[in-house]
Every structure is written in structure tokens, then in C-alpha cells.
Interface confidence: low
């Protein structure tokens, strides 16, 4: 019995009812192996999910986003809002970084400015949500020929973490 | 059915260059992220580059940074890793993935091996 | 960078047994960050779990991931002779992104 079975091809399942016929996929269902005893629900691409390939009898449905959300998850299993530089990616979303704190990348989530006066610096360029401060000479340390300041390296480590 | 496709690895010179393209089928290559991801003989996986779907956003490990450089041509569904300076420590299997960015690579290649050797 | 930190490096079992991976991170990292491989001789790695928890498209339930904050874990319930393989975790949640230095399940 189960040598029928195995006969059975992609698209098709092998109909216990029917003396182990292969019978085709009903509508909206599929099975992309042969040999199967039933055949598999399509995947339905709905609210901000949009069909970028229909199911076929062989081959599940896939989906994309629509504008304004990207797939996250294996086989794109959740769209998330599109997050931009001054944001975080949260369980909700994407959110705006809180005053104090900045992220100039697309990962990861909102850090804590530099604090210029740990060491004994000043607020060169203010802080933004996209972009950290940066630190230039102390007032004291003001003087002809002081060189420029530079930027900090960006900092690696999350300042907190997303709610 | 989604393929990733490594190709133009090989043995070069410590000094010398190479390119590793990555072909990608079975998926709207234009839609995702992609990285880069290698792996040493007999050692672990080390995240190599990344490039956002328009390609205007990249990002380096820093042992690569300044030597290497990720592009895509969307229109030829490709990804590229343009190797400059190559030393003896980037041998290893290189490996193109898509790239999920929260949720980890889902997709991977079958690697190609660059040897860096004298 | 977050350092991610496995153990142990060589997991000795027979099939059938449960087998309990760990993956510590030098820092703090969100769940939905963390994400679990599987790597066999001579082959690309398989995403197994994402977001710490979730499996992946195809991926058995004998394998089940949890953790939040520094620690995660990789728990097989019962391995079958195909789970004997390395198995690294990876975070996604700050740049660079890194992954753990392997897990290797044995036969025993």
C-alpha cells in the first residue's frame, strides 16, 4: 500500500477514500513532494502582506510587504515598518530615539550621546537623533594653534534595551 | 525556490585581489539585505559585510574594513565582495547570505574557498 | 562588539537523549536579535531559530530556543541521528554582528 503512495507526484495527494488514488490538490492547497497523504493550505498574502507568487498545486504562495514595511522572519512571516537612521526597531516597530540618544544605522537600537565632560571636554556639535555630539577642547584648552576636533568613534554598545 | 550562487574564488598571492559574486534566484533580490559571511578552516563563521536593497548602505567587519567592498547590480539579481590587499588570514570559505537583518540569514550559498597563499 | 560566549565546546550524546546549548552574551542583547545555526561537514549553515525563539520554515519541533537578555539556550528534545552537527548562535543586534564559537554535538 504505501509503494502506491509513493507513486503519487507533486500536486496531487494519495486519497485514503479512493482505494489510494492520487488525487489533484483541491483548490487553495498544494503539496510539493510526492507521496503525500494530504495536501498543504496555501498561504493567503493578506493585510500588509501582498502576493509576489501565487500558489500553484506544487508550490506554496509567497509574500512580500506593502510600501512602507519590509519582511522579517523566515519566508518574510512578518512585516515590520520601515525603520530609518534617528530610530529603533522595537517589538512595536519602529520607534523615534528618545532625546539623548542616537542611531546612525539601519541595526540596532538608540545609544547615549557621548558625555564630552567625562573627559573634561566640551559640546562641539550638539547631539541628534541621528547623529552623536561631538567633543572638542575644554574652554581652558582654547588657545592659538589648538588642533581641530574629531568626531568620536561611534559607539558599538546598546545604551538600553528596546521595550 | 530560493539560490544563492558563490563564485570567483581561487588561490592568490598575499597582496593581490580578487572577486566573489553571488547569484540569487527564486526571490526578489531588489527586497533584501545581503551579506557576506566567512568561515576559516576549521574555525567558526565571521560576519564579513552588508549592503542594504538599494545598495546605498554598506557595513565592514573591521579585519576587512578599508579592503573590501560589497556592491549589488539589482537588474543582474548579483551580489559582489571585491577583495583588495588580500593577507593570509582572509582564507576561508565565503559564503553570500540573505540577510533578514533582525531575524539572522535564512538563505545561504554554498561558499566559495579563497586560499591566500604564497 | 558583543561577544558571544558557547558552551559547552563538545557535547557528547546518543541519539534519543536531550541535548542543552548555551549562548552567553558580553552584553545585554534583545531576544529578537538572536538567532540559531546549524552547520554540517561540508555545507552551508541553516538558520534553525530566529528571534530567540522561533523556528524557522521546515525546522522540526524537537528544536526549541529560549533566553532573554545575556543568556539563550538551544535545547534539542530528542536527538535524531541528522542533528549531530555545530551549532552557533549569532546576534543581529548591534554592528558588528558576531556569532558564538560553535557548539559541536557528537555521537557518543
Known amino acids: 500500500l504505501q509503494d502506491l503512495c509513493s507513486n503519487c507526484p507533486a500536486g496531487t495527494f494519495c486519497d485514503n477514500n479512493r482505494s489510494q488514488i492520487c488525487s489533484p490538490c483541491p483548490p487553495n492547497s498544494f503539496s510539493s513532494a510526492g507521496g503525500q497523504r494530504t495536501c498543504d493550505i496555501c498561504r493567503q498574502c493578506k493585510g500588509v502582506f501582498k502576493t509576489r507568487k501565487e500558489c500553484s498545486s506544487t508550490s506554496n504562495a509567497e509574500c512580500d510587504c506593502i510600501s512602507g514595511y519590509h519582511c522579517l522572519g523566515a519566508e518574510c512571516s512578518m512585516c515590520e515598518q520601515d525603520c530609518k537612521q534617528g530610530q529603533e526597531l522595537t517589538k512595536k516597530g519602529c520607534k523615534d530615539c528618545c532625546f539623548g540618544t542616537f542611531n546612525d544605522q539601519k541595526r540596532g537600537i538608540c545609544r547615549p550621546w557621548t558625555n564630552c565632560s567625562l573627559d573634561g571636554k566640551s559640546v562641539l556639535v550638539n547631539g541628534t537623533k541621528e547623529r552623536d555630539v561631538v567633543c572638542g577642547p575644554s574652554p581652558a584648552d582654547l588657545s592659538p594653534g589648538a588642533s581641530s576636533a574629531t568626531p568620536p568613534a561611534p559607539a558599538r554598545e546598546p545604551g538600553h534595551s528596546p521595550q | 525556490e530560493v539560490q544563492l550562487l558563490e563564485s570567483g574564488g581561487g588561490l592568490v598571492q598575499p597582496g593581490g585581489s580578487l572577486r566573489l559574486s553571488c547569484a540569487a534566484s527564486?526571490?526578489?533580490?531588489?527586497?533584501?539585505?545581503m551579506s557576506w559571511v566567512r568561515q576559516a578552516p576549521g574555525k567558526g563563521l565571521e560576519w564579513v559585510s552588508d549592503?542594504?536593497?538599494?545598495?546605498?548602505?554598506?557595513d565592514y567587519a573591521d579585519s576587512v574594513k578599508g579592503r573590501f567592498t560589497i556592491s549589488r547590480d539589482n537588474s543582474k539579481n548579483t551580489l559582489y565582495l571585491q577583495m583588495n590587499s588580500l593577507r593570509a588570514e582572509d582564507t576561508a570559505v565565503y559564503y553570500c547570505a540573505r540577510d533578514l537583518l533582525v531575524y539572522g540569514f535564512d538563505y545561504w550559498g554554498q561558499g566559495t574557498l579563497v586560499t591566500v597563499s604564497s | 562588539e558583543i561577544v558571544l560566549t558557547q558552551s559547552p565546546g563538545t557535547l557528547s550524546l546518543s541519539p534519543g537523549e536531550r541535548a542543552t546549548l548555551s549562548c552567553r552574551a558580553s552584553?545585554?542583547?534583545?531576544?529578537?536579535?538572536l538567532a540559531w545555526y546549524q552547520q554540517k561537514p561540508g555545507q552551508a549553515p541553516r538558520l534553525l531559530i530566529y528571534g530567540a525563539s522561533s523556528r524557522a520554515t521546515g525546522i522540526p519541533d524537537r528544536f526549541s530556543g529560549s533566553g532573554s537578555g545575556t543568556d539563550f539556550t538551544l535545547t534539542i528534545s530528542r536527538l535524531e541521528p541528522e542533528d549531530f552537527a555545530v551549532y552557533y548562535c549569532q546576534q543581529s543586534y548591534s554592528y558588528p554582528v558576531t556569532f558564538g564559537q560553535g557548539t559541536k554535538v557528537e555521537i557518543k
Open positions: 527564486g526571490f526578489t533580490f531588489s527586497s533584501y539585505d
Open positions: 549592503i542594504d536593497p538599494t545598495g546605498s548602505k554598506t
Open positions: 552584553q545585554s542583547v534583545s531576544s529578537s536579535y
